[in-house]
């Protein structure tokens, strides 16, 4: 029985050229997190595996940084980074939990007035 819930940073905006932290948090379960995937709909960005550590998709290595924690930091943002990001928590014994974040990358002057969310 999957009792857990995923909390995410929800819809976030950031400015072009800046950076953003994508973060999810699994709560209400004692299940052990064995792997977390960060993905877009058509490709994987990063994997944090309990045994193997972090793997970053090669094309993103120079502007994606692991962490903080199980989160992911995107740097040198471009308008093309706008879109959906998924965190997939592989857990034992519960199974898989998925969270969704929508990132909008804006021109600097617009982004300054946009809402930003971050899970403490």
């Amino acid at each position: 029985m999957m009792t857990g819930t995923i909390e995410t940073t929800g819809n976030i905006s950031a400015e072009k050229g800046g950076s953003i932290i994508l973060q999810c948090h699994l709560s209400s379960t004692t299940a052990q997190v064995t792997q977390v995937n960060w993905e877009q709909q058509d490709q994987l960005l990063a994997i944090c595996n309990a045994d193997l550590g972090w793997h970053i998709y090669p094309a993103f290595k120079d502007r994606v940084a692991p962490g903080p924690g199980l989160g992911l930091t995107l740097q040198s943002l471009t308008v093309n980074d706008t879109g959906e990001y998924f965190c997939i928590y592989h857990t034992y014994p519960d199974g898989t939990y998925t969270g969704r974040i929508f990132l909008e990358v804006l021109e600097s002057s617009v982004a300054e007035h946009g809402a930003r969310f971050q899970i403490p």
Epitope: E39, Q41, L44, I88
Partner: antibody, heavy 118, light 107 residues
């Protein structure tokens, strides 16, 4: 329970356009996931054709991109495959499938055989 | 495109035997590999995702392992109902690609 069901002509003439429908029941195609087409020539392996996501964005296999269009009718909870300029090499069982990020293709239709022949 | 090469292409084993299939990716795909079972005339069924995680309802005799470019799928004790063709698939990036399949038969 999610169910996917392919339908369409079983025979298509060379150079014509293959058109298939995938009817989804038990889940709204606008709620989540990527809705895919995958094919399997007789006695051969599986080839991913492309998808339309719940938000309407599409992604195609580069090997077929110039001939493929995937679209949807949200009111009927259906999505469609069109493959133009078909040849005998396009003869295959065509499957629709639901993909979940991080997992793979967890739900499949039963498949429909399309033969390209004059 | 990422090529997935499976071996062997077919095998014959006795009921109760341990069966192992390997899959090699043409580049590092971390743990983004799934395994499917396809019986004749039927659609494939997802068995394993992310290299080693059993999908809901899949019997414990099916397991997967590996990371990077080398992956293994194992049936710990072959049952008559396991006669099928098994495919690996990378879910690392599009175009998503499959191995050519391994046909498992009973001796």
């Amino acid at each position: 329970q999610v169910q996917l069901q392919e339908s369409g002509p079983g025979l298509v003439k060379p150079s014509e356009t293959l058109s298939l429908t995938c009817a989804v029941s038990g889940y709204s195609i606008t709620s989540d996931y990527a809705w895919n087409w995958i094919r399997q020539p007789p006695g051969k392996g599986l080839e991913w054709i492309g998808y339309i996501s719940y938000s309407g964005s599409t992604s195609y296999n580069p090997s077929l991109r110039s001939r493929v269009t995937i679209s949807r009718d949200t009111s009927k909870n259906q999505f469609f495959l069109k493959l133009s300029s078909v040849t005998a090499a396009d003869t295959a069982v065509y499957y629709c499938a639901r993909r979940q990020v991080g997992l793979g293709f967890a739900y499949w239709g039963q498949g429909t055989l399309v033969t390209v022949s004059s | 495109d990422i090529q997935m090469t499976q071996s062997p292409s077919s095998l014959s084993a006795s009921v109760g035997d341990r069966v192992t299939i390997t899959c090699k990716a043409s580049q590092d795909v971390s743990t983004a590999v799934a395994w499917y079972q396809q019986k004749p005339g039927k659609a494939p069924k997802l068995l394993i995702y992310s290299a080693s995680y059993r999908y809901t309802g899949v019997p414990s005799r099916f397991s997967g392992s590996g990371s990077g470019t080398d992956f293994t799928f194992t049936i710990s004790s072959l049952q008559p109902e396991d006669i099928a063709t098994y495919y690996c698939q990378q879910h690392y990036s599009t175009p998503w690609t499959f191995g050519q399949g391994t046909k498992v038969e009973i001796k």
